[in-house]
């Protein structure tokens, strides 16, 4: 059976039941690769209270429709007089980014999730060439979600003192130049999430490969690398790379623009102070 949402397949995704202190790991096309959940678990529940793991969805027992994915298990659940099995159910809705699976509720037998994602859209209008997961949970299971920063067209201009070049970036996905045809970005190669513009030329200096990472409390890191082997002649033989560090501000303040903090041999380091780097509880307070 072919994978129903191939663009979601490359990653293991996370969702949280905050009420019960549970972290779910979800891999919709394969298994989550957590030993304690067994070799074929597609949905693995990590109970942080008891430090135990339980598989609540088996990759082998998958059934799919256009908007619903179900993973059964062979574990029976306690509903009296029935032979129900524990299962996970993921409802997919069209969204503007890859999005995040959200825990909805869990009964004795079924763990329910909802996922707003471009992967579920009938038309390709919001689909990216390349996009990576754009959220993380910290050790207290609080969500840090940069999805609202993702530009569906155009890009962010990085604050840089160099008058001869302009560095444009998008967050977690490539820059869509087709929907923004009148700008400098038109020359940016397809797939690039970090585009360096020099005069009338534009260069791919990084594409998203891995999802967002939490490196320290309230510091999130996104790394882009140039996939093509061909070196750029102004990089002194080095492969271009871009590291964007998103920082939660220490106090309430207006959002800033991304700033270039270091540049050497086509390695660009960017810092972006933004409240989106803060956990969701902070944003909602």
């Amino acid at each position: 059976q072919a994978a129903p949402f191939p663009e979601l397949c490359s990653y293991t995704w996370e969702a949280v039941d905050t009420k019960n202190n549970v972290l779910y790991k979800i891999n919709i096309c394969g298994s989550v690769d957590i030993v304690q959940c067994g070799p074929s678990s597609a949905v693995c529940m990590h109970d942080l209270k008891t430090r135990t793991y339980h598989s609540v969805g088996d990759s082998v027992l998958r059934s799919a429709t256009r908007s619903l994915l179900e993973f059964n298990t062979t574990v029976s659940c306690d509903q009296q007089g029935t032979n129900h099995r524990v299962q996970s159910s993921i409802a997919f809705l069209c969204g503007k980014t890859l999005g995040t699976p959200e825990f909805v509720t869990a009964t004795e037998c079924v763990h329910y999730f909802e996922w707003r994602t471009t992967a579920a859209c009938k038309k390709d209008i919001f689909k990216a060439n390349k996009e990576v997961p754009c959220y993380v949970f910290d050790e207290e299971l609080r969500k840090h979600d940069l999805n609202p920063l993702i530009k569906l067209s155009g890009a962010y201009l990085v604050d840089d003192s160099d008058p001869d070049t302009s560095l444009f970036i998008n967050v977690c996905r490539d820059i869509d130049t087709l929907r923004d045809p009148g700008s400098q970005l038109r020359a940016c190669p397809p797939g690039t999430a970090a585009c360096l513009v020099r005069g009338h030329q534009a260069f791919d200096v990084g594409q998203p490969r891995d999802g967002l990472k939490l490196v320290r409390k309230d510091r999130l890191v996104l790394s882009y690398v140039r996939e093509e082997a061909g070196k750029l002649d102004f990089c002194d033989g080095h492969s271009p790379a871009v590291t964007i560090t998103f920082v939660c501000p220490s106090e309430r303040r207006e959002g800033t623009i991304p700033k270039l903090t270091a540049k050497s041999n086509c390695r660009y380091e960017i810092e972006w102070i933004t409240e989106y780097a803060c956990h969701r509880d902070y944003l909602e307070s």
């Epitope: 009420k19 019960n20 202190n21 549970v22 209270k49 869990a106 004795e108 037998c109």
Partner: nanobody, 116 residues
Framework: DVQLVESGGGLVQPGGSLRLSCAAS????????MDWYRQAPGKQREWVAT???????TYADSVKGRFTISRDNAKNTVYLQMNSLRPEDTAVYYC??????????WGQGTLVTVSS
């Protein structure tokens, strides 16, 4: 005052059954996740079963198929039905309530002895 009170422990023969109760007061019971733990003499406290606020249940491998956790929200009580008891089930059984807004609350424990 927030408290949990366990009851139902006692002496039972191997293969027998017991039902433990844990009555809660001072908390919105249905919002809380409830866990049973046990501590055998000279051993560390170990987790036995969980009943989440939404209703899902999980069990330690050692009790799976023999023990059942359930709750009665009207009575603010969680139960642990223990069947096919074995000598190695002998322990003090504790219940625990937890929610995102409260620190974990433990009961004082009830002793279960399985012996012939």
């Amino acid at each position: 005052d927030v408290q949990l009170v366990e009851s139902g422990g006692g002496l039972v023969q191997p293969g027998g059954s017991l039902r433990l109760s844990c009555a809660a007061s001072g908390i919105i019971f249905s919002d809380n996740r409830m866990d049973w733990y046990r501590q055998a003499p000279g051993k560390q406290r170990e987790w036995v079963a969980t009943l989440a606020s939404y209703g899902w249940k999980t069990y330690a491998d050692s009790v799976k198929g023999r023990f059942t956790i359930s709750r009665d929200n009207a009575k603010n009580t969680v139960y642990l039905q223990m069947n096919s008891l074995r000598p190695e089930d002998t322990a003090v059984y504790y219940c625990k309530a937890s929610s995102p807004v409260l620190n974990d609350i433990w009961g004082q424990g009830t002793l279960v002895t399985v012996s012939s």
